[in-house]
Interface confidence: low
């Protein structure tokens, strides 16, 4: 099984114990590590952070001691903007320039492949996204002719049914991608006006979502139905939680909220907590399991957080094995307890390790 793990370059800027550099990563934990994110400037793939080249080096030296580890560079992301990707992908010359720029950049910096994180193609971009993937793969095949190992090509896709329908020609893009990471999280947010888990495995009877699409099981099943081969589908598991501020004394699933939860001490983003911040939160909190959804949530005062723990990630891994998927994807290593100092287990990356162990279990 693949264990595809994202590392985010901006995690270096978190203060104190939240700051994470690639040299803190475990070289034997994941089969693939994806560095997020690269930029595109003047239609060429490019660095994003001022010290990306240094960090690329840190990451890729992990392979010195684990030659089986594959590293990929992810291009795009939330801050890149869908419009910029659209302009490049829809223009034949821009697309060609971008595609040509990728292999030398990856080779120079020691990466084994490219991950496309176009979040998200619009309805009009659907065909262009397919073309981009098809042509990128053709370039990778051509570039590898002189006996080089062919560069890998993957994509991170939304798990939302509406986005899947409008953005992706699943059957076609699946032919050209080495694997597909389906982002089976962020199904529920403060916009719903109620509490709810952002990454349920199933639609439980407790689910407050107005649809039956907002769960991992549906998204995976839908992707398979649309023609994604199980052997290429990698299922996303979050090492972060989504939090809400309760608006009343109700604390269950579907309770009214006044907005996102208060920012974490290190991640500093309202409505989001890293797993290591959740471990802090759990001291003195009340933990509940949403049985049908097979995930936990915790409450403390007027704060509510839906997250994944070692038990829920094991359920998710069992599920992906049952559906004979290619493996698991983790967003993100730097949101797990990467120091092993927050969650009281004396274990670095407890969630990712639980995923790895469950994948290896017979």
């Amino acid at each position: 099984y693949k264990l595809v793990c994202y590392y985010t370059s901006w995690s270096q800027y978190r203060e104190g114990d939240g700051s994470c550099f690639p040299d803190a990563l475990d070289r034997f934990l994941c089969t693939h590590i994806i560095y997020s994110f690269a930029n595109i400037s003047n239609d060429h793939i490019d660095t994003w952070e001022w010290n990306d080249v240094t960090l690329y080096g840190m990451l890729n030296t992990l392979k010195n001691r684990n030659p089986n580890l594959k590293t990929l560079l992810s291009v795009g992301g939330w801050n890149f903007g869908s419009q910029r990707f659209s302009k490049i992908a829809s223009n034949t010359q821009s697309r060609r320039t971008f595609i040509k720029s990728v292999p030398p950049f990856l080779r120079t910096h020691g990466f084994d492949g490219l991950d496309l994180a176009w979040l998200y193609p619009g309805r009009r971009d659907k065909q262009h996204f397919t073309t981009l993937i098809k042509e990128m793969k053709a370039e990778f095949i051509k570039e590898a002719q002189p006996g080089k190992k062919q560069l890998l090509l993957s994509a991170a896709l939304s798990a939302g049914k509406v986005t899947i329908d409008s953005s992706y020609d699943i059957a076609k893009i699946s032919q050209h991608l080495d694997f597909i990471s389906i982002m089976t999280y962020d199904f529920h947010g403060a916009w719903r006006g109620t509490t709810g888990h952002h990454s349920p495995l199933f639609r439980g009877q407790e689910d407050a979502s107005p649809d039956r699409f907002s769960n991992t099981d549906y998204a995976v099943g839908y992707m398979l139905r649309l023609g994604a081969p199980a052997s290429k589908l990698v299922m996303g598991i979050p090492t972060f939680g989504r939090s809400f501020t309760l608006a009343s004394s109700e604390t269950g699933v579907g309770a009214p909220i006044s907005g996102p939860g208060i920012p974490g001490r290190f991640t500093k983003e309202a409505g989001t907590l890293a797993y290591y911040e959740i471990c802090d939160f759990l001291r003195g909190a009340t933990v509940h399991r949403i049985l049908g959804q097979q995930v936990p949530y915790a409450t403390k005062g007027n704060q509510w957080v839906g997250y994944d723990d070692q038990e829920s990630v094991k359920s998710k891994v069992q599920y992906l094995k049952d559906r004979q998927l290619a493996g698991a994807m983790v967003w993100a290593l730097d949101l797990d307890d990467f120091q092993g100092s927050f969650c009281g287990q004396d274990l670095r990356f407890p969630l990712t390790n639980a995923i790895k162990d469950a994948l290896a279990a017979t």
Epitope: F202, R203, V220, G221
Partner: antibody
Framework: QSVKESGGGLVQPEGSLTLTCTAS?????????MCWVRQAPGKGLEWIAC???????TYYASWAKGRFTISKTSSTTVTLQMTSLTAADTATYFC?????????????WGPGTLVTVSS | AQVLTQTPASVEAAVGGTVTIKCQAS??????LAWYQQKPGQPPKLLIY???YLASGVSSRFKGSRSGTEYTLTISDLECVDAATYYC???????????FGGGTEVVVK
């Protein structure tokens, strides 16, 4: 909330019949799969087909493809068209709606309608 | 195609006793299994979903469990009203295939 089947009765071998499932107290919104299941006298349950109202997708048991067609005909009715009927198709036909649980879990069943294929 | 093999076909037990019904899946379906109870002349009634979760209004005397591809329905403190035929059903969606097991008749003495 309830569902009720109609349209059953006696039919000649090689004949055709259309069964209707009518909902009361709810409409076939995008949240539901509607399914047909049959049960021959003294035998077990046998799944025939489902329709997913969200996108109109249809699903059939391999043996039912070609002879049975499931359709949504209105916001409160689903039909099952059956052709080339034989004595082996004699059964009580149930219409069932799925629950908002994981997978297609049938928690709302009609009382059934009996179809007898005989000359 | 998925095949669910239910055993035994029939079982007899006394009031207050315990009955165990097995359902073996031919392929891996994870927790995608439901159990139904059916009495003569009536449609089936949902008991258990996601292998082990009790449907609303169902007595806690009914318990579902799973070990690999083998699923078990246990009825404890048997009552006369439990006399019925019990069916397992696989519940995948996304790739819908709703196989039923052959059924197990429970006779209560």
């Amino acid at each position: 909330q309830s569902v009720k089947e109609s349209g059953g009765g006696l039919v000649q071998p090689e004949g055709s019949l259309t069964l209707t499932c009518t909902a009361s107290g709810f409409s076939f919104s995008s949240s539901y799969y509607m399914c047909w299941v049959r049960q021959a006298p003294g035998k077990g349950l046998e799944w025939i087909a489902c329709i997913y109202n969200g996108d109109g997708s249809t699903y059939y048991a391999s043996w039912a493809k070609g002879r049975f067609t499931i359709s949504k005909t209105s916001s409160t009715t689903v039909t099952l068209q059956m052709t080339s009927l034989t004595a082996a198709d004699t059964a009580t036909y149930f219409c069932a709606r799925d629950a908002d649980y994981a997978g297609v879990v049938l928690n709302l069943w009609g009382p059934g309608t009996l179809v007898t294929v005989s000359s | 195609a998925q095949v669910l093999t239910q055993t035994p076909a029939s079982v007899e037990a006394a009031v207050g006793g315990t009955v165990t019904i097995k359902c073996q899946a031919s392929e891996s379906i994870g927790n995608a299994l439901a159990w139904y109870q059916q009495k003569p002349g009536q449609p089936p009634k949902l008991l258990i979903y996601v292998a082990s979760y009790l449907a609303s209004g169902v007595s806690s005397r009914f318990k579902g469990s799973r070990s690999g591809t083998e699923y078990t329905l246990t009825i404890s403190d048997l009552e006369c009203v439990d006399a019925a035929t019990y069916y397992c059903q696989c519940t995948w969606y996304g790739n819908v295939y709703l196989a039923f097991g052959g059924g197990t008749e429970v006779v209560v003495k």
